[in-house]
């Protein structure tokens, strides 16, 4: 694996070449890392401390803002509350979502007291309306946490927002919500660590499981603890969950609570030389790769090790029938809390539990009507036996022998003169952005990894904790603690001044156009473009 | 009709032990959350002890933790709470109670409680 | 000494309107957990009264409302009654542990 970027980029010459643009925060604001992108628009929405944030995407330069803080009674009784001030008793936005054509809706920790409101956008980018609905405020639980240190994955779709939060002050009542339109909010169950097991959520999102509406899930991705029994001693694992999106809660048991859920563990490991695997287990990111068929993105996980010995970062890539596969497969059963899991090899009962009613699948109107058996189980058995495997049984990226971990990712898709391919940018917790190409081999999905940049886009060392990509302007968007840094995804011209170079690079923005390392544009009809991303070979490319 | 009855009570010596029961009826008890309650003689309600339908979580009052330990047999409707080295400020009036979750934000309500059971802590 | 602070007693002819306060802290009420209550004859056990801060459950006369505000809450009785003579209690979730608190009690006197 090579290892050695291509290009290594400081901070300073990331500047000096034009190649950074950096909001480096306000005095009074921190923790930029709530992101929604609108290429519409063309705007970067950042939820952060006390302010919510429109940024140009041409230019985050340009930008507008709201100041949304607490009341000072709210502030005092949360310093009354034995909390910090400025770290805590602030309105930390974690939740930004697109709530229909003229607003967003925005959800923050109160300063341990979620509330949550709408923002007017208006209905046209032209109509340059940014403002808050100070007359309409909601209660923020089980939508925001109330401690801005946990992390909180949100979805909003059809007016309805769901969330994986903690809905207490105290931060352990963890749970996946449903809240806002005209239902009964719905929620994991209370109380049971099968379900949820002090999880720390990372992402969720709407996938589609076939035409028909009516089967569509809604997955959230988190890494929790280990249940006992699952691991010896205390383990992390990294997981899956599926809801559907028409679930409505049970009866008796499950009244208002989930009944399709069910969750699966994420492996992400690599043999090591005695024969006892290395996993990467802390899942940091997830980004879905959406390509021809939305109902099968390949799903690109960043994870890190739970070892404070061994550090070390991989990136895993997972297909959506590997998913499914393993959501029809056995669920986990254990007889009591000293017995070890084992696949259920009893009845299951029909409809099978995490099934949506719909007429696809089954002859069920609604998951109120499910019958006692399929309750009983589903509220026992949330949990699947089998692990979802990576593409390949292994990672497509591993680092160990460096000073940082991977926190975040974003993946391009590049057509090049030979394929495609894709391109991902991976954030770390010194601020740094890695540019790495995975190149097929044999197959399309056994890859080899090219780092073919390294580029330090904060001038302190600062862990990178939201990171979009816009396609239409070819720009990457980096949120952190201390601000948020704009760059190009392509830096064509650094690479050098000769043919050779430029094709040795293979970066597949990037071709010799005769006289100069630029942009490809595969629609451009010019013989004289000299790329060659799977083998980086001048020789056959480039006759200077 | 839910109905809930304790049992067990009685003058126990301090440092002793009592084990309360509470038969439960009327509804499906394996599925939800029970709980005792007390209450000291012309004083205000306590919440003592808590257990999910599972038994996956079991939650204590500072004051009893390593003292009472509660427990359930779903296969009997039955809810127990083993008090061991018993004190004077245990005396008490204790009540069975079944957690509700009525509201919207599944914050523990106490729907149906049995007419209790009277622990004397006395030497 | 209870978590919820409430008036050791309140007091009202019959047909009168009466309140009884219930007041927390950011920690249980003001976290904006819900708050319930419950109403306790003499002699008998608890029952629930409000659920939800606001809930009646059947068979509870409309003449009881509940709500909240802030770090507070308050049950309101209209319409006072002789068989409404009882202790009144608030209760709130207050996380894992103690999981749930109640207010101290507040016995409620119909004169005449």
């Known amino acids: 694996k090579n290892n050695v970027p291509r290009l290594k980029l400081s901070y300073k010459e990331m500047l000096e070449s034009n190649n950074v643009i950096t909001f480096n925060g306000l005095a009074n604001s921190s923790s930029y890392h709530t992101f929604l992108l609108d290429e519409e628009r063309s705007r970067l929405y950042v939820g952060a401390k006390d302010h919510i944030f429109s940024f140009d995407l041409v230019n985050i330069k340009d930008f507008q803002k709201i100041v949304w803080p607490v009341s000072y009674t709210r502030r005092d009784e949360c310093k009354w509350a034995g909390k910090d001030i400025l770290k805590e008793c602030a309105n930390f936005i974690k939740v930004l979502k697109a709530y229909n054509q003229t607003h967003l809706y925005a959800c923050g920790t109160g300063a341990f007291h979620p509330i949550c409101t709408y923002i007017e956008i208006g209905h046209h980018p032209e109509d340059n309306i940014f403002k808050l609905e100070n007359s309409h405020f909601e209660n923020g639980r089980g939508k925001s946490p109330y401690d801005p240190k946990l992390l909180t994955a949100s979805l909003l779709i059809d007016g309805e927002l769901y969330s994986g939060t903690a809905a207490d002050f105290m931060g352990r009542d963890f749970a996946i919500f449903r809240t806002l339109g005209h239902h009964h909010p719905i929620r994991t169950e209370q109380h049971d660590s099968r379900w949820l097991n002090d999880p720390k959520f990372i992402s969720a999102h709407l996938i589609s499981e076939s035409d028909n509406p009516e089967d569509d899930k809604v997955y959230f991705f988190f890494r929790e603890n280990a249940i006992d029994g699952e691991h010896s001693g205390k383990a992390t694992h990294a997981r899956i969950g599926q809801i559907c999106k028409n679930d409505f809660g049970g009866h008796r048991s499950l009244v208002n609570k989930w009944t399709t859920f069910l969750k699966a563990r994420l492996i992400c490991s690599v043999p090591g030389p005695n024969g006892i695997d290395t996993h990467f287990d802390e899942l940091q990111d997830v980004f879905l790769m959406n390509f021809k068929d939305p109902k099968n993105p390949v799903v690109y996980g960043v994870f890190t090790t739970s070892s404070n010995i061994f550090k070390g970062s991989a990136v895993c890539m997972y297909s959506m029938s590997d998913v499914r596969r393993v959501f029809l497969g056995p669920y986990a059963h254990r007889d009591g809390p000293n017995y070890q899991w084992v696949p259920y090899q009893g009845r299951v009962p029909y409809p099978r539990p995490g099934t949506c009613p719909s007429k696809t699948f089954g002859g069920f109107d609604s998951t109120k009507d499910l019958p006692d058996d399929v309750i009983t189980f589903a509220r026992s058995h949330p949990a699947m036996y089998n692990p979802v495997f990576p593409m390949n049984n292994r990672p497509i990226v591993i680092k160990t022998d460096v000073n940082y971990q991977f926190t975040q990712i974003v993946v391009d898709r590049v057509d090049a003169e030979d394929g495609q391919y894709d391109v991902m940018f991976i954030g770390t917790d010194v601020g740094t952005v890695l540019k790495v190409v995975s190149i097929p081999k044999e197959t399309w999905y056994d890859l080899e990894e090219v780092l073919l940049e390294e580029m330090t886009v904060f001038r302190e060392p600062t862990a990178i904790s939201a990171m979009e990509l816009s396609t239409k302007q070819q720009q990457l968007y980096i949120g952190s603690t201390a601000g948020v840094a704009q760059l190009p995804l392509h830096r064509c011209d650094i690479y050098g001044k000769a043919c050779a170079e430029c094709c040795l690079a293979r970066d597949p923005y990037c071709a010799w156009d005769g006289s100069a390392c630029s942009r490809y544009f595969p629609t451009a009809k010019r013989a004289t473009r000299a790329q060659d991303i799977r083998n980086g070979d001048p020789l056959t490319h480039c006759s200077d | 009709e839910v109905q809930l009855l304790e049992s067990g009570g009685g003058l126990v010596q301090p440092g002793g032990s009592l084990r309360l029961s509470c038969a439960a009826s009327?509804?499906?008890?394996?599925?939800?959350?029970m709980n005792w309650v007390r209450q000291a003689p012309g004083k205000g309600l306590e919440w003592v002890s808590g257990?999910?339908?599972?038994?996956?979580?079991?939650g204590y009052a500072d004051s009893v933790k390593g003292r009472f330990t509660i427990s359930r047999d779903n296969s009997k409707n039955t809810l127990y709470l083993q008090m061991n080295s018993l004190r004077a400020e245990d005396t008490a009036v204790y009540y069975c109670?079944?957690?509700?979750?009525?509201?919207?934000?599944?914050?523990?309500?106490?729907?149906?409680w049995g007419q209790g059971t009277l622990v004397t802590v006395s030497s | 000494q209870s978590v919820l602070t409430q008036p050791p007693s309140v007091s009202g002819a019959p047909g009168q309107r009466v309140t009884i306060s219930c007041t927390g802290s950011?920690?249980?009420?003001?976290?904006?957990?819900?708050v319930h209550w419950y109403q306790q004859l003499p002699g008998t056990a608890p029952k629930l009264l409000i659920y939800?801060?606001?809930n009646r459950p059947s068979g509870v006369p409309d003449r009881f409302s509940g709500s909240k505000s802030g770090t507070s809450a308050s049950l309101a009785i209209t319409g006072l009654q002789a068989e409404d003579e009882a202790d009144y209690y608030c209760?709130?979730?207050?996380?894992?542990?103690?999981?749930?608190?109640f207010g101290g009690g507040t016995k409620l006197t119909v004169l005449g």
């Open positions: 257990i999910s339908w599972n038994s996956g979580w079991i």
């Open positions: 209760q709130s979730y207050a996380g894992p542990n103690p999981y749930v608190v």
């Open positions: 950011s920690s249980n009420i003001g976290a904006g957990y819900d």
């Open positions: 009327g509804f499906d008890f394996s599925s939800y959350e």
């Open positions: 109670a079944r957690s509700g979750y009525s509201s919207s934000w599944f914050d523990p309500d106490f729907d149906y």
């Open positions: 939800g801060n606001s």
